[in-house]
Interface confidence: low
């Protein structure tokens, strides 16, 4: 024993009480209450386990310690005293940690970070999800390709991120009533055509299409060089009345002031209606044709280059008018006969009949159309009786097969041929010039002259003319020639029959028609030997 | 095409505040967010911040926030970034960039750039 | 804030050469990494995006590897217009971070 009369073999954790005993320190406990024996230990009290003598409070955790213990706050809560441990429930100020607030990017990005009690979660925002790698990372939802298909088919669905929209596509606007973005939109096409939303040249039209416009030509005008047709940007200049003047190196009165008058027509034509101008083109070629004035004294390939030019160019404006004109059937017959018939419509492929007096086609209305021109498709005839004095003296081009032919029918050469037009002149156009070679060849009927008229003075009326010996009835068609001026030729046409004062041809490609009654000037073999 | 046009330089004087922009085309303005990124020879490329056009909502880049403001006018399909207190530190090329999204995530179409000289 | 450190600022190469471009990330960013290419007086253009995709336009002598921490891009046969200074760029976690760049120069 010590000096205090204290036992020195006290265990661990313990002091002593006399000379004899020892009692555990406080938080620790042994066998018995006082210890007499150096073989007792004095063992660790922990107040933590249950039952607990030890209330810490809400949010908080009992941790043992060596003949002690602590209470301390729960992960996720702070003591607002700010010390951190405290021994029963009455010290107990654990609160909440806002871990949002601590570390805003606990939830990383397009993630919204939700404190709770002790803990935060993660929420990615509307229209995210969390990749698969991280929980904490969202990632935008592309709701537009994710087979939720969450737009109406009238819209396009424009993925954004964290959202989408459903907008309307291009050229289309939300129906009455309808928002444009939400997925609730529902759309429809504009008509920016109607609406004034185009910008559309004024030299143009303006076409509406679905989700779009286009831009075309004006009737009678044409795009400007290097400019496509039907687009948003076209640019079109006039083109109505560009090329009438004289062939080069004609020198003729009557002619030029014919031109000049056209021309001033052509100046006429902006302020009056197609049907006016068509009326007054077919007026001036007819004086022409009554009063040839100096012409009649050109010679003869001259007269017939001035035809030749003459039909082309009533051909293109023919065309280009027709274009201004209302769908449906035109005819015009001026006092001299001459006629035009016009068929304008929608393309399509059914067989179209059209024509009159003079002359009458049958064709596949898509040979009509083309493929250039989207528009109504045009169809014409335009027959000139009076062309004597123009087409006088004209020739005709017999190909080497057609020459062969008549050779072997004749059994001898072909010297020359005595030509007598039975019809009028008959040009055929349609809404486009690629007519060298149809795609179906077409039907026509041409009406012979009541007294015809043979190119080289009157004849007696021909009405059912049949041919004699060494005649034949022809479908022959001015063709351009640099040495001639012109001439007739009937390549790709042919004659079905002939009946009731006309005549049927099948031909495969376009011209000026008329029907000819040829004479063949046959070499006679008995007479060559007699005058050898 | 789609394009961010932006102005090519500003000088401004040290202390004062510049305000730039970046104006969108060929696409629907409200549909992307737009994204500020500086880039000077010394720090390379930073981010600012980013603006959702739609709802004017931003996010920013803590060493720019108090010095760079994100706002957007969707009249004029404009974004703008207006830095403020300019010192010879702020020097640099502000590009404007829209923010793709969706499974790509990057800047697909990028302005030109505003080059910014801080100088008296 | 994650660190994006392209350790070499220049990279001396010839036109065939194969060249490849580390980056390497301050801690995890998965495989959010775009690499950009920016030639001078222009404005960056994406090369790669998710380290490896390629984005449809860029030559497939263009290539990204890496997740992580680890990021290559490799350009295959350099040819003359590949010069220029190449960025990588997290977009992980805010603030998107990018690279100092490695200018990719001729011998």
């Known amino acids: 024993q010590d000096s205090r009369g204290c036992a020195r073999w006290c265990p661990q954790n313990s002091s002593c009480v006399n000379a004899t005993a020892c009692r555990c320190n406080p938080g620790f406990s042994s066998f018995s209450e006082i210890i007499t024996t150096p073989t007792e230990t004095c063992d660790d009290i922990n107040e933590c386990a249950t039952p607990s003598k030890v209330s810490c409070g809400k949010f908080s955790d009992c941790w043992n310690t060596e003949g002690s213990y602590d209470c301390v706050c729960s992960p996720g809560y702070e003591p607002v005293s700010g010390a951190k441990t405290f021994k029963n429930e009455s010290e107990n100020t654990c609160q909440d940690v806002d871990e949002c607030q601590q570390n805003p990017r606990l939830c990383k990005s397009y993630g919204t970070c939700v404190n709770t009690l002790g803990s935060y979660t993660c929420q990615c925002l509307p229209g995210f999800k969390f990749i698969p790698e991280d929980p904490k990372v969202c990632t935008d939802v592309n709701e537009c390709t994710s087979g939720q298909n969450p737009c109406h088919s009238s819209t396009h669905c424009l993925n954004n991120v964290g959202s989408y929209q459903c907008r309307c596509r291009p050229g289309w606007q939300p129906i009455p009533g309808s928002p444009n973005g939400p997925n609730n939109t529902v759309c429809e096409d504009v008509d920016e055509c109607s609406s004034g939303q185009h910008q559309c040249d004024s030299s143009t039209v303006c076409f509406n299409t679905v989700g779009s416009y286009s831009c075309r030509c004006r009737p009678g005008w044409k795009p400007r060089h290097g400019i496509p047709n039907n687009q948003k940007d076209t640019v079109c200049e006039d083109m109505t009345f560009s090329t009438w003047t004289p062939p080069p190196g004609v020198h003729s009165q009557t002619l030029s002031r014919f031109f000049d008058k056209v021309q001033d027509l052509g100046r006429d034509s902006k302020t009056s209606s197609a049907e006016v101008t068509i009326q007054n083109v077919i007026k001036l070629v007819d004086e022409l044709m009554e009063a040839p004035g100096d012409v009649e004294a050109l010679a003869p390939p001259v007269r017939h280059l001035i035809a030749t030019q003459l039909l082309s160019n009533l051909e293109d404006i023919m065309r280009i008018l027709a274009k201004s004109l209302p769908k449906g059937p035109f005819t015009y017959i001026s006092p001299s006969n001459t006629e035009l018939t016009l068929m304008i419509q929608e393309r399509g492929d059914k067989n179209v009949t059209m024509g009159q007096s003079s002359a009458r086609m049958k064709l596949n209305w898509a040979v009509a159309a083309g493929a250039e021109d989207p528009g109504p498709a045009v169809a014409g005839i335009l027959s000139i009786q009076n062309m004597t004095t123009l087409l006088a003296n004209a020739s005709l081009n017999l190909h080497s097969k057609k020459q062969a032919e008549l050779e072997e029918i004749y059994e001898s050469s072909i010297r020359g041929v005595q030509l007598r037009r039975l019809s009028a002149v008959n040009s055929i156009f349609l809404s486009h010039n690629n007519t060298k070679e149809l795609n179906s060849p077409i039907l026509f009927a041409f009406s012979h002259l009541e007294s015809s008229d043979g190119e080289a003075g009157r004849d007696p009326p021909a009405k059912d003319v049949m041919p004699g010996p060494r005649q034949e009835l022809l479908c022959a068609f001015w063709k351009s020639d640099s040495d001639r001026g012109g001439h007739w030729a009937t390549e790709g046409c042919q004659v079905l029959g002939s009946k009731n004062g006309s005549t049927t041809c099948q031909c495969s490609h376009l011209s000026s028609f008329a029907i000819l009654m040829a004479h063949y000037d046959v070499e006679d073999w008995k007479l060559t030997l007699i005058t050898r | 095409q789609v394009q961010l046009q932006q102005p090519g330089a500003e000088l401004v004087k040290p202390g004062a505040s510049v305000k730039m922009s970046c104006k969108a085309s060929g696409y629907t303005f409200t549909s992307y967010n737009i994204h500020w990124v500086k880039q000077t020879p010394g720090q390379g490329l930073e981010w600012i911040g980013a603006i959702s056009p739609g709802n004017g909502d931003t996010s920013y880049n803590r060493k720019f926030k108090g010095k760079a403001t994100l706002t957007a006018d969707i009249s004029s399909s404009t974004a703008y970034l207006q830095l403020s207190s300019l010192t010879s530190e702020d020097s640099a090329v502000y590009f404007c960039a829209r923010f793709y999204g969706g499974s790509y995530w990057y800047f697909d179409v990028w302005g030109a750039g505003t080059t910014v000289t801080v100088s008296s | 804030d994650i660190v994006m450190t392209q350790s070499q600022k220049f990279m001396s190469t010839s036109v065939g050469d194969r060249v490849s471009v580390t980056c390497k990330a301050s801690?995890?960013?998965?495989?959010?990494v775009v690499w950009y290419q920016q030639k001078p007086g222009q404005s960056p253009k994406a090369l790669i995006y998710?380290?490896?995709y390629r984005f449809s336009g860029v030559p497939d002598r263009f290539t990204g590897s890496g997740s992580g921490t680890d990021f290559t891009l490799t350009i295959s046969n350099v040819q003359s217009e590949d010069l220029a200074e190449f960025f990588c760029q997290q977009y992980n976690s805010s603030p998107l971070t990018f690279g100092a760049g490695t200018k990719l120069e001729l011998k």
């Open positions: 998710s380290a490896s």
């Open positions: 801690q995890n960013v998965g495989i959010n």
